[in-house]
């Protein structure tokens, strides 16, 4: 098994996590990409996705998560704005490539969010002050909320414009076979 490394980010509440996940340009430029949290026991959980196929440098905002896929640079930029202590955890970028298993982009991100100082919460350059100037996305092809044998009625989260489930179930296997190794801090 491949040994996974972690990149640690220590930030204060109200700041922005800004990471770039590199990928092989020719292979994955238009593939759908996802930002996942790794729950206890190696259980990846998708939090946000790019469109399918992924659009070049088109920001997708889902709640406080903003994804931008730069095809010409072969990188997925992930921002989590207005960080909260509860956002602390282990994250990863993956590329969906059905029917094969998702491809994990190294390194994993170990995010540690601590309470800010009593001063203005977003007063440094990593703060969230400017991030909401991004025009809200109206994308409809984000990752599905839920799958069931029949159709699904759903509403988008209040903080995003429109999120809807693709017509068919995405037939994916989990990345755990690739990533079942100890985590190193």
């Amino acid at each position: 098994a491949t040994k996974l490394t972690e990149e640690k980010y220590e930030l204060k509440e109200g700041q922005t996590l800004d990471v770039k996940c590199d990928y092989t340009l020719e292979k994955f430029a238009s593939s759908q990409k996802a930002w996942q949290i790794i729950r206890d026991g190696e259980m990846p959980k998708t939090l946000a996705c790019t469109e399918r196929p992924s659009k070049n440098s088109h920001p997708v905002q889902v709640g406080r998560i903003i994804l931008e896929d730069y095809h010409d640079h072969g990188l997925l930029r992930v921002r989590m704005v207005n960080l909260q202590v509860e956002d602390s955890g282990l994250y990863q970028c993956v590329i969906y490539q059905p029917p094969k298993e998702p491809h994990m982009l190294f390194d994993r991100i170990r995010l540690v969010v601590t309470k800010g100082f009593s001063g203005t919460p977003g007063s440094n350059e990593n703060s969230t002050q400017n991030v909401y100037k991004i025009p809200p996305t109206t994308t409809k092809a984000l990752c599905p909320l839920y799958t069931s044998p029949r159709t699904v009625t759903q509403a988008p989260p209040k903080s995003t414009a429109d999120v809807s489930t693709p017509d068919s179930e995405i037939n994916l296997t989990n990345v755990t076979d690739i990533i079942r190794v100890p985590v190193f801090n």
């Epitope: 889902v62 709640g63 839920y146 799958t147 995405i170 994916l172 990345v175």
Partner: antibody
Framework: QVQLVQSGAEVKKPGASVKVSCKAS????????IHWVRQAPGQGLEWMGI????????SYAQKFQGRVTMTRDTSTSTVYMELSSLRSEDTAVYYC??????????????WGQGTMVTVSS | DIVMTQSPLSLPVTPGEPASISCRSS???????????LDWYLQKPGQSPQLLIY???NRASGVPDRFSGSGSGTDFTLKISRVEAEDVGVYYC?????????FGGGTKVEIK
């Protein structure tokens, strides 16, 4: 048809172990996590743990740590939950339920029919 | 662990009348992606639980539109606009914001 079919009722003595199976059909087995939830007679629902059928990794509720083991057999699309050192308080209906790891929701959209486990001397 | 508190414990209802169940969590269930990780299940007598509402306010497949979920953060409500006889059973809220998943104690809905 998407379903989870569980093994039949069991009667066990205190101190013994029980192994309940949950066979999945109608979907890609490795694409969904399987959780185990139990319900003592006349009581509420209690989450026990989760297994990722793709790699076999698990996470258990603290309360069951050391007594519960969840495994899977991908060749038969079956998940197993074994509970050891049984006591009378373990008398309950045990349910398996599926959750998708690749969808945003964590909801349990499909549940097994439940397996009654009675612990009695 | 996140503690889920449901009220009332028992809810006698009249068919055709509205009903409301409250669920409160000890920590916020709002995730960074803007979704509240709170689901509602109904367990009819002698049956397995069934999903009604997921992510706080999304109705699951096949669930009648008389059921609706609302709320954010730590306070959530399940509403039945007009109760029908088939709605009797125990309603549970469940948080899936962090492991271990935890359920509310349940609300038993019965016809008056």
């Amino acid at each position: 048809q998407v379903q989870l079919v569980q093994s039949g009722a069991e009667v066990k003595k205190p101190g013994a172990s029980v192994k309940v199976s949950c066979k999945a059909s109608g979907y890609t087995f490795t694409s969904y996590y399987i959780h185990w939830v139990r319900q003592a007679p006349g009581q509420g629902l209690e989450w026990m743990g989760i297994i990722n059928p793709s790699g076999g990794s698990t996470s258990y509720a603290q309360k069951f740590q050391g007594r519960v083991t969840m495994t899977r057999d991908t060749s038969t699309s079956t998940v197993y939950m074994e509970l050891s050192s049984l006591r009378s308080e373990d008398t309950a209906v045990y349910y398996c339920a599926r959750e998708s790891g690749y969808h945003v929701s964590t909801a349990f959209d499909i549940w097994g029919q439940g397996t009654m486990v009675t612990v009695s001397s | 662990d996140i503690v889920m508190t449901q009220s009332p414990l028992s809810l006698p209802v009249t068919p055709g009348e509205p009903a409301s169940i409250s669920c409160r969590s000890s920590q916020s269930l709002l995730h960074s992606n803007g979704y509240n990780y709170l689901d509602w299940y109904l367990q009819k007598p002698g049956q397995s639980p069934q999903l009604l509402i997921y992510l706080g306010s999304n109705r699951a497949s096949g669930v009648p539109d008389r059921f609706s979920g609302s709320g954010s953060g730590t306070d959530f409500t399940l509403k039945i606009s007009r109760v029908e006889a088939e709605d009797v059973g125990v309603y549970y809220c469940m948080q899936a914001r962090q492991l271990p998943w935890t359920f509310g104690g349940g609300t038993k809905v019965e016809i008056k």
